[in-house]
Amino acid sequence: MMTGTIETTGNISAEKGGSIILQCHLSSTTAQVTQVNWEQQDQLLAICNADLGWHISPSFKDRVAPGPGLGLTLQSLTVNDTGEYFCIYHTYPDGTYTGRIFLEVLESSVAEHGARFQIP
């Protein structure tokens, strides 16, 4: 039975040209994490694997930095970065846990951080 929960940074906004940290936290499970994937819609951004470390997709290498922790930092944001981002925790023996973050990249300086929420 999957008992874990993922807490994410929820709905967030940031300014064009700036940077933002995407974070997910898996808790309430003793399952061993073997890999964490970061995806934007259907595109793979980055992987952190237990044995291989970090892999950043070549198309995002210049704008994505791993960390802090298992999070992901997006840099030089453009309006096209607006959309859904997913963290996918691969665990044993539980299986897969997925968290969702919605990022809105704004033209002006009215960007505010949204509330945090939990995905069971």
């Epitope: 807490e7 940290i21 974070q23 936290h25 898996l26 808790s27 003793t30 994490v33 073997t34 890999q35 964490v36 952190c48 694997n49 237990a50 291989l52 470390g53 970090w54 892999h55 950043i56 290498k61 930095a65 791993p66 960390g67 802090p68 922790g69 298992l70």
Partner: antibody, heavy 117, light 107 residues
Framework: QVQLQQPGSELVRPGASVKLSCKAS????????MHWVKQRHGQGLEWIGN????????NYDEKFKNKGTLTVDTSSNIAYMHLSSLTSEDSAVYYC??????????WGQGTTLTVSS | DIVLTQSPATLSVTPGDSVSLSCRAS??????LHWFQQKSHESPRLLIN???QSISGIPSRFRGSGSGTDFTLTINSLETEDFGVYFC?????????FGGGTKLEIK
Amino acid sequence: QVQLQQPGSELVRPGASVKLSCKASGYTFTSYWMHWVKQRHGQGLEWIGNIFPGSGTTNYDEKFKNKGTLTVDTSSNIAYMHLSSLTSEDSAVYYCAREGLYAFDYWGQGTTLTVSS
Amino acid sequence: DIVLTQSPATLSVTPGDSVSLSCRASQNIRNSLHWFQQKSHESPRLLINYASQSISGIPSRFRGSGSGTDFTLTINSLETEDFGVYFCQQSNSWPYTFGGGTKLEIK
């Protein structure tokens, strides 16, 4: 197996600079953060900063921004920390540590830096 | 910066006892908290990561719990090899920070 090799000790004069090294082996050097940690006289641990060899991205604690510079040589899998304008306060053990999925899972043995005239 | 406060600073215990070490964060760090053991003249060793995740090769008597701002490392049935200094560390945000440590000594 994963190893982080550091020289045992370095002796330098006050006001001078030193470049500490950390030779990584047994894993893909460019895929893991390398951190540097300071420990004085067996006291607490202080995080200095880190570098991601795959991109050269660095982060520093504000306290060490004007003291240390982190670099890597990806052709030889060596991480470096350059410390400048050394004083007795910089005398300490300096560790390098790898961070991946499982946090700081491997540490070097530490280099004891002595700043003395 | 996130400040991690460990208590007590020193703990005198007898082998066979069970102990709980505390680490408190100055702000919510979710579960981005790791525990290390350091023996004299040795490098730190990772015991628990992400608050409660066990590490391969670490005895099961070491258990981590907590989330948010309050974290605990519990060591059941202490063995003589467990004496040393224990540090917590956060990876929720740069700069990473360490707690001041708890020294576990033989009574």
